[in-house]
Structure formats: structure tokens, C-alpha cells
Interface confidence: medium
């Protein structure tokens, strides 16, 4: 299950991965030294019945339909880290791998 | 981040894990031999700003607020498998570990 990739010109209404560049300078996040911006991507779109479901569980909850379950939503199903240079809480400048920064794939869960 | 656990009597409105027993017999899924039912759990509730976010990315997308991003939703952030005995598509009886069957933790992503 590779997920769908879209862009701002796509007519796709279903769950899809879209490009997004996050700009730390624009946020005023001056504790991040590098990168100043990076390609993060994001997930958006509708989760139709059985479409792009990562887990069997998603379908089972749809079948069971318990109180308060809102149905699956379009969310990251595969993410990757990036290397960053940043101030830690001791005000040391650290080079480190930060997990969960890039969306590689979107799906319904 | 251990997530929240709730039950049907809880007044919690935020993203939480609720108990759910999936009953394969009730679904009429006769190709599943065992278990006939199991504790699957599910996720439900609101994702307030910065609450229970699994990934830094979730907060970054909220900051960037791109077109069509619906905000984070309450979804499984940790899942586990169960062992099952079932008929496969060749009508062989298989004993296997099926991933993504139990919600261990819920969060906002």
C-alpha cells in the first residue's frame, strides 16, 4: 500500500499526501539552526469505506461501529526523521536525528 | 506519551482509547476459526491544540495550516498483533500473527 501522492492542482478528493515545506524562520522558531526549512508533506482527503486502510482494525471498528467512533481519518501511516541542528533544553547546540518529521505515506486509520 | 484510557462512563472529551470487543461471529465472518472474539479497542475524542501529538510534524502542520489540512485526528499511535487461526484464500487453515489488530494507544496525528 503505497498511498496516493497529490499536489495543489490535483482533483483527488480521497486521502492523499500533499507537498508542504515547513519554514522555521517564518514561525520564528530561532532555536532551530538547520535546516531553516524542510519538506514535511501532509495528509488530506476523505476516507471512503475500505480505502487506503493501514490496519485490519480500521475495518473492524467500522463494522462494529461503537458509540463515538468517528470513522477513519486521513493520517500519516509512514513517517521518517530528519537531521537537525538545534538548541536543546540546556542551551547546547546539538546535531540530532528527530523522528516523525516527514510524511512518507498517508492512509486511513 | 502513554495516551489516555477511557470507558463508556468517562466524561473525557479528548482523544482517548476505549474498550471494544470485536465479535467475528456477530459479523458472520466464518472464515475466522479462532479467536471468535477479541479485545480490539478503538480511539475517539477531540484533538485540541498540542494534545497527545505523536509526531512533531503534527504541530508543524497546524502552524503552517496548508489548504485542505483538517487538523489532527484521534487515531491509533501504537498497535499490536494477535495470533489467529483462519482460512486463507486457498481454503487452507493457517495459524498466523496478524498485525494491526489491537489498539494499544491513541493519539493525535
Amino acid at each position: 500500500n503505497l498511498g496516493l501522492d497529490c499536489d495543489e492542482h490535483s482533483s483527488e478528493s480521497r486521502c492523499c499526501r500533499y507537498p508542504l515545506t515547513v519554514d522555521f524562520e517564518a514561525f520564528g522558531w530561532d532555536w532551530i539552526i538547520a535546516p531553516k526549512r524542510y519538506k514535511a508533506n501532509y495528509c488530506s482527503g476523505q476516507c471512503e469505506y475500505m480505502f487506503m486502510q493501514k490496519y485490519p482494525h480500521t475495518h473492524l471498528v467500522q463494522q462494529a461501529n461503537p458509540r463515538g467512533s468517528a470513522g477513519p481519518c486521513c493520517t500519516p501511516t509512514k513517517m521518517s526523521p530528519i537531521n537537525m541542528l538545534y538548541f536543546n533544553d540546556k542551551q547546547q547546540i546539538i546535531y540530532g536525528k528527530i523522528p516523525g518529521m516527514v510524511v512518507d505515506r498517508c492512509g486511513c486509520s | 506519551n502513554l495516551g489516555l484510557d477511557c470507558d463508556e462512563h468517562s466524561s473525557e472529551s479528548r482523544c482517548c482509547r476505549y474498550p471494544l470487543t470485536v465479535d467475528f461471529e456477530a459479523f458472520g465472518w466464518d472464515w475466522i476459526i479462532a479467536p471468535k472474539r477479541y479485545k480490539a479497542n478503538y480511539c475517539s475524542g477531540q484533538c485540541e491544540y498540542m494534545f497527545m501529538q505523536k509526531y512533531p510534524h503534527t504541530h508543524l502542520v497546524q502552524q503552517a495550516n496548508p489548504r485542505g489540512s483538517a487538523g489532527p485526528c484521534c487515531t491509533p499511535t501504537k498497535m499490536s498483533p494477535i495470533n489467529m487461526l483462519y482460512f486463507n484464500d486457498k481454503q487452507q487453515i493457517i495459524y498466523g500473527k496478524i498485525p494491526g489488530m489491537v489498539v494499544d494507544r491513541c493519539g493525535c496525528s
Epitope: E25, A34, P35, K36, R37, P81, Q92, I93, I94, Y95 | -
Partner: antibody
Framework: EVQLVQLGPGLVKPSETLSLTCTVS??????????WGWIRQPPGKGLEWIGT???????YYNPSLKSRVTISVDTSKNQFSLKLSSVTAADTAVYYC?????????????????WGQGTTVTVSS | AIQMTQSPSSLSASVGDRVTITCRAS??????LGWYQQKPGKAPKRLIY???SLQSGVPSRFSGSGSGTEFSLTLSSLQPEDFATYFC?????????FGQGTKVEIK
């Protein structure tokens, strides 16, 4: 291909300020993936990182030199400069400028590549 | 600041020899280490990044290994052009710090 060319005097008197510039060619100093640094090497010794700057003017200095160092960027001239005040004989060294490259995918970083040709600075009266 | 202790400070070897240089960090730096070669009167050139990844264009006789606090650079078969000074660089915590260098001379 980015190249760095250094300019500055080879002799500085004690207690004066050492000034060097590094001109960037083959690329923009304002590229958001580039950071610009200075390193020095005293005679017969190892390398010492002095500091690094970003085109917006944000700078990071080696604490051992911080009180005496200023690194600045002139985007209009596509160059950056080093000023080291109150120099002594201990500041005699070959001074290098260099680029750090940070890929916006976040996967690939390249420290100190390329380098300038080096400037030998002697502190002596 | 993290101290980088490089050994030996110098060594004599012949063409074809296998040579290993080590670098020890005063604290854990994961694999955030590079190796540089410097020839007299020239700027250093990066050989290895991320402790063990070979820089594009660098001959495969150069290899790096290690993580945490112990690192090594190995030249599997020394060539005439490899006689130079080698430095390690840690880029885990500012200030970046270099080893004091190992001079590889012709025996």
C-alpha cells in the same frame, strides 16, 4: 560550483583587530541551505572552529573566542567577514573560510566544504 | 567542549601498507564524525562523513568505522598521494572540535 576566495592582511599588530573577508562565487550567499564559517590552524597545530553565520545574520561562535569574534554577512557583495579583536601572538594561524551545506530534505549535511584557500596571519609588532 | 584525542600523532609507512588512525571522543557523539585529509599548504578535504560514509570521489581504500566514542580511519593500501595529515571532526555538539591530527610520512 561554489568557490570561496579570501582577502585580508597577512600581518596584524598585537592588540589590534584582525579583519578577513571571504567572497562567494558560483552560488548565492543567501541560499537558505548554506551556512558560512571560519576555522583557523596555528602553525604545526590542529584546526579550531571559530564560528558560523547564516545569511540572515544569525551567528554561532566558539565559546573560547566569543568575546573577541564578530562574523558578519554582506549579501549585496556576496561575502562574509571575520573580525577578531585584541589579537596576541597566540592568534597567529592560517585562517580558512568554509561553507556548511544543509540539504532541505534533512538527510544530508556537509560540514566545511568547500574551503577558501587560507590566509596566513601573523601577529607581530 | 568535547575533546577529540587522535592517535598516533605521526606514523611512518610504506606504499601498500595498511594504516589505521583512531580518534576518541570525550563523550558519546553517536556517529557525528568526519575525517579530513590535509596536504601541506592546502585546505583540508573531507574523506568520510557520518563516521563511515565515503565522500563522493574519494577512493574506496579509505574507510571509516566506529560510533559513540571510538572511531577509526583505515587506509587499506597506502598510495604515494596519501602521505598527508589526517584530522577527525566531531559535529555532535557545538563547538565543533577537531582532533590534533595524524601525520602520515613515508618510511
Amino acid at each position: 560550483e561554489v568557490q570561496l576566495v579570501q582577502l585580508g592582511p597577512g600581518l596584524v599588530k598585537p592588540s589590534e583587530t584582525l579583519s578577513l573577508t571571504c567572497t562567494v562565487s558560483g552560488g548565492s550567499i543567501s541560499n537558505s541551505n548554506y551556512y558560512w564559517g571560519w576555522i583557523r590552524q596555528p602553525p604545526g597545530k590542529g584546526l579550531e572552529w571559530i564560528g558560523t553565520t547564516y545569511y540572515s545574520g544569525t551567528t554561532y561562535y566558539n565559546p573560547s573566542l566569543k568575546s573577541r569574534v564578530t562574523i558578519s554577512v554582506d549579501t549585496s557583495k556576496n561575502q562574509f567577514s571575520l573580525k577578531l579583536s585584541s589579537v596576541t601572538a597566540a592568534d597567529t594561524a592560517v585562517y580558512y573560510c568554509a561553507r556548511d551545506y544543509y540539504d532541505s530534505s534533512g538527510y544530508y549535511y556537509n560540514w566545511f566544504d568547500p574551503w577558501g584557500q587560507g590566509t596566513t596571519v601573523t601577529v607581530s609588532s | 567542549a568535547i575533546q577529540m584525542t587522535q592517535s598516533p600523532s605521526s606514523l611512518s609507512a610504506s606504499v601498500g601498507d595498511r594504516v589505521t588512525i583512531t580518534c576518541r571522543a570525550s563523550q558519546d557523539i553517536r556517529n557525528d564524525l568526519g575525517w579530513y585529509q590535509q596536504k601541506p599548504g592546502k585546505a583540508p578535504k573531507r574523506l568520510i562523513y557520518a563516521a563511515s560514509s565515503l565522500q563522493s570521489g574519494v577512493p574506496s581504500r579509505f574507510s571509516g568505522s566506529g560510533s559513540g566514542t571510538e572511531f577509526s580511519l583505515t587506509l587499506s593500501s597506502l598510495q604515494p598521494e596519501d602521505f598527508a595529515t589526517y584530522f577527525c571532526l566531531q559535529h555532535h555538539i557545538y563547538p565543533w572540535t577537531f582532533g590534533q591530527g595524524t601525520k602520515v610520512e613515508i618510511k
